[in-house]
Interface confidence: low
């Protein structure tokens, strides 16, 4: 707490500028009025203030606006942001996408900091969900913003937004986030032609089902090993050998190099070995022939 | 891309003036301060002086007080550094460095401007 | 002149973790984020570190930035020949604004 001082004669502060930088912290503390930061506070982020003045600044704002800043206060907080606290940030009402920008582009090239994640999260909860326009700005200054929303969270998501998401955004996904997000994906580019749709789909295939993989098996989409290992295993699982084979097109000899890793691992042990066989790609581990093949999970929900 | 270009060596005598500029590309010139900062051969870096390109408020390092003047023409994006009463320990190369908002770091430099101070 | 001490040269072979110190006071370590320069012979100085331990995109994840109190100091593992150069400290003085410290020669054995 800076300590209730009188302004020396003379340092009264008509606006916010350059001088202020040249005065210690109590004389900040007594000399420049609240309401004239609040009015110039784009002004501050271009002086050259120490971080020990900007405490002060804060403090006086602090004072001000103990239930919150304004918006129009917020847009112009710049490094003054980094000043703030998570409970500081929850006590806001950021509706507009330009002052979200504007906070983000001072924490840019920084770590999601807990300020951040608290600023992003009343944000999106003002808006209700999770527009095209919000997640455009949160994946460009963030790609694993996506990643690192809960379930539930991304239940939110309308499929209109999907439209906005990079491969890269899903890099750090789980099967539950793509088993939630994949649907919205098939919705959205529902209208696309083969091969356009390929190319949009497959970041979210982590998610898809074994229906769907069959769908495009029949589709010549040669899907790349590194989208085949991100396949979720129950839905690989079912897949015949020539539906494999058709999936991957060319890429079906990489199946080799993956053979002692999951979903391939598992699959080979559900394969005929004759039909594995047939790949010529040497891979062992198929059921002998001549053995019965149980499903078991149609056993179990006959009984 | 942002860029700082400065002009080239420079050779003077001792009691003479050097202006030194440093003409940015890539940003909005305006929207940084422009510092200098100065290397003499095999020593450290030693900062010189700050100023605001959209209002042209200066300042300057104490040593420096009194023969430094730092300008801007912001119609081409250059900013200026003159030094005057130049002695032999001013040989130096001298640096443009853009400041980087909310903190003292520079972000950016121009790439040197040698001056030599020999009779 | 110089307000911040660093010690004239550090070496390490490749692979090596080396570290530099940068030493000040209250007026400036002390009260204001610390920033790093590596200046590769003949080139301009470029920013390594920002705010004690902030890495400008493109700076390897192999250098990292520390402050404790009025020190601060610079961490560089996995060493590599093209990691040798000149090191400097720098922060903002209350009393004479930016300030460097004298610089550190890393030499890559």
């Known amino acids: 707490e800076v300590e209730k001082t009188a302004c020396p004669s003379g340092k009264k502060a008509r606006e916010i500028d350059e001088s202020l930088i040249f005065y210690k912290k109590w004389e900040l503390e007594a000399c420049v009025d609240a309401a004239l930061l609040a009015t110039q506070m784009d002004r501050v982020n271009a002086i050259p203030f120490t971080y020990e003045q900007l405490d002060v600044l804060k403090h006086k704002l602090d004072e001000l606006y103990p239930q919150g800043y304004p918006e129009s206060v917020i847009q112009h907080l710049g490094y003054l942001f980094l000043k703030m606290s998570p409970e500081d940030i929850r006590k806001w009402n950021v509706t507009s996408l330009e002052t979200l920008k504007a906070l983000l582009e001072v924490n840019k090239g920084h770590e999601m900091s807990p300020q951040v994640a608290t600023l992003i999260d009343r944000f999106v909860k003002g808006r209700g969900q999770l527009d095209k326009d919000t997640l455009d700005t949160l994946t460009a200054f963030y790609p694993g913003y996506l990643c690192s929303l809960s379930p539930e969270e991304l239940s939110s998501v309308p499929p209109s937004s999907i439209w906005a998401v990079r491969p890269q955004d899903l890099d750090t996904c789980d099967p539950r986030q793509l088993d939630v997000l994949y649907p919205k994906a098939r919705l959205a580019f529902q209208n696309m032609n083969g091969s356009e749709y390929f190319v949009k789909i497959q970041s979210f295939l982590g998610g898809a089902p074994t229906e769907d993989l069959k769908a495009l098996s029949q589709q010549n989409v040669s899907m790349d090993l590194a989208t085949f290992m991100k396949l979720r295993t129950d839905a690989v699982l079912p897949l015949t050998v020539a539906e494999v084979q058709k999936l991957l097109g060319p890429h079906v000899e990489g199946l080799k190099a993956e053979e002692r890793h999951r979903p391939v691992r598992d699959w080979i042990l559900r394969q005929r070995q004759d039909d594995l066989d047939t790949l010529g790609l040497g891979l062992q581990g198929g059921i002998p022939n001549g053995y019965l093949v149980l499903d078991l999970s149609m056993q179990e929900a006959l009984s | 891309q942002v860029q700082l270009v400065q002009s080239g060596a420079e050779v003077k005598k001792p009691g003479a003036s050097v202006k030194v500029s440093c003409k940015a590309s890539g940003y909005t010139f305006t929207g940084n301060y422009i510092n200098w900062v100065r290397q003499a051969p095999g020593q450290g870096l030693e900062w010189m002086g700050i100023?605001?390109?959209?209002?042209?408020?200066?300042l300057y390092a104490q040593k420096f007080q009194g023969r430094v003047t730092m300008t801007r023409d912001t119609s081409i994006s250059t900013a200026y550094m003159e030094l005057s009463s130049l002695r032999s320990e001013d040989t130096a190369v001298y640096y443009c460095?853009?400041?980087?908002?909310?903190?003292?770091?520079?972000?950016?430099w121009g790439q040197g401007t040698l001056v030599t101070v020999s009779s | 002149d110089i307000v911040l001490t660093q010690p004239p040269s550090v070496s390490g072979a490749p692979g090596q973790r080396v570290t530099i110190s940068c030493s000040g006071s209250?007026?400036?370590?002390?009260?204001?984020?610390v920033s790093w320069y590596q200046q590769l012979p003949g080139t301009a100085p470029k920013l390594l570190i920002y705010?004690?331990?902030q890495r400008p995109s493109g700076v390897p994840d192999r250098f990292s930035g520390s402050k404790s109190g009025t020190s601060a100091s610079l961490a560089i593992t996995g060493l590599q020949s093209e990691d040798e150069a000149d090191y400097y400290c720098?922060?903002?003085?209350?009393?004479?604004?930016?300030?460097f410290g004298g610089g550190t020669k890393l030499t890559v054995l």
């Open positions: 705010n004690d331990n």
């Open positions: 460095a853009r400041w980087h908002h909310g903190t003292w770091i520079f972000d950016y």
């Open positions: 720098s922060t903002y003085d209350r009393r004479t604004f930016s300030v």
């Open positions: 100023i605001n390109p959209t209002k042209g408020w200066t």
């Open positions: 209250s007026s400036n370590i002390g009260s204001n984020y």
